[in-house]
Interface confidence: low
């Protein structure tokens, strides 16, 4: 069954399934794009960013990416195609509802990103441990 | 060809409700986020509220507050909004706007109505 | 909220002219700027969104720039109707607020 935050009308045009022939629907994500960030230090942060904006395309999910350097902490709040690399990275944890973050390698910064598929699932951007891979509830398809 | 058309404004005393209607044409309705936006006579536009294309986020207006309450009904292709404890100052046109969805256009309203009246007056 | 202060409030110009008008915001809104012309009795029509794109079906005349706090809409060549009132509008945050309009009168 389709969870009750993504039961929208079916426009032909729109339809997307996935691996599963789940009906997937345009997603509903934050989107402000780059804006600096108070986040730091903590467990999890919520993206403070007042924009929400229905995805292009049905397949695209929502991502978040954390910069630390010398200078400034950034938040990027966006829609994008799994399929595709975004900052050089593959969206590994697109099925999640939640948006957990992974350290990235990137030179002369701390990096982190996540990436989500329940709406406007990066509004809420978590950092702790206790949310880690391993555990097999954040690794289901939120289509069940 | 994307068309909007607001009803259900009119005359209506202070303390008062109306509610105001849009229906939808020409467009996916239920993949973008609507707006309502007026404008008192002679006077400069003024954002009222937001709803997004699922109904589940809606943002207010501090001015409007807990009294006015945005909806809408996807099946209809119709945008909802119920005006209560009305105000001299809420006197305005109306116009029902369509919210552009993606990237550099988010915030934009790319499609109006021609708006409907409400005077509030004793 | 975020203060949209337009300028100048209104102006007469003649068929021709160049026309510029300004927009300042009242804290960096990054690039998202709208512009919107509005004719008296009519809705509000899209010009120009994130600051400098063409709204599609706008004609070419129209221009934007800026970012950050300052912002400017240009008609390189007025024609007659281009005669009204126009809104800057930041959509950087919510509530997206408008500046208080520019009327463009004939001289």
């Known amino acids: 069954t389709i969870p009750p935050h993504v039961q929208k009308s079916v426009n032909n045009d729109m339809i997307v399934t996935d691996n599963n022939g789940a009906v997937k629907f345009p997603q509903l994500c934050k989107f402000c794009d780059v804006r600096f960030s108070t986040c730091d230090n903590q467990k999890s942060c919520m993206s403070n960013c007042s924009i929400t904006s229905i995805c292009e395309k049905p397949q695209e999910v929502c991502v978040a990416v954390w910069r630390k350097n010398d200078e400034n902490i950034t938040l990027e709040t966006v829609c994008h195609d799994p399929k595709l690399p975004y900052h050089d990275f593959i969206l590994e944890d697109a099925a999640s509802p939640k948006c957990i973050m992974k350290e990235k390698k990137k030179p002369g910064e701390t990096f982190f990103m996540c990436s989500c598929s329940s709406d406007e699932c990066n509004d809420n951007i978590i950092f702790s441990e206790e949310y880690n891979t391993s555990n097999p509830d954040l690794l289901l398809v939120i289509f069940q | 060809e994307v068309q909007l058309v607001e009803s259900g404004g009119g005359l209506v005393q202070p303390g008062g409700s109306l509610r105001l209607s849009c229906a939808a044409s020409?467009?996916?309705?239920?993949?973008?986020?609507m707006t309502w936006v007026r404008q008192a006579p002679g006077k400069g536009l003024e954002w009222v509220s937001v709803?997004?294309?699922?109904?589940?986020?809606?943002y207010y207006a501090d001015s409007v507050k807990g009294r006015f309450t945005i909806s809408r009904d996807n099946s209809k292709n119709t945008l909802y909004l119920q005006m209560n404890s009305l105000r001299a100052e809420d006197t305005a046109v109306y116009y029902c706007?369509?919210?552009?969805?993606?990237?550099?256009?988010?915030?934009?309203?790319?499609?109006w109505g021609q708006g409907t009246l409400v005077t509030v007056s004793s | 909220d975020i203060q949209m202060t337009q300028s100048p409030s209104s102006l007469s110009a003649s068929v021709g002219d160049r026309v510029t008008i300004t927009c300042r915001a009242s804290q960096s809104i990054s690039s998202y700027l709208n512009w919107y012309q509005q004719k008296p009795g009519k809705a509000p029509k899209l010009l120009i969104y994130?600051?400098?794109s063409l709204q599609s079906g706008v004609p070419s005349r129209f221009s934007g720039s800026g970012s950050g706090t300052d912002f400017t809409l240009t008609i390189s060549s007025l024609q007659p109707e281009d005669f009204a009132t126009y809104y800057c509008?930041?959509?950087?945050?919510?509530?997206?607020?408008f500046g208080q309009g520019t009327k463009v009168e004939i001289k």
């Open positions: 709803i997004s294309g699922s109904g589940g986020t809606t």
């Open positions: 509008q930041q959509s950087y945050s919510t509530p997206p607020t």
């Open positions: 020409g467009f996916s309705f239920d993949i973008y986020a």
């Open positions: 994130a600051a400098s």
């Open positions: 706007a369509r919210r552009a969805q993606y990237r550099d256009k988010v915030g934009a309203t790319d499609y």
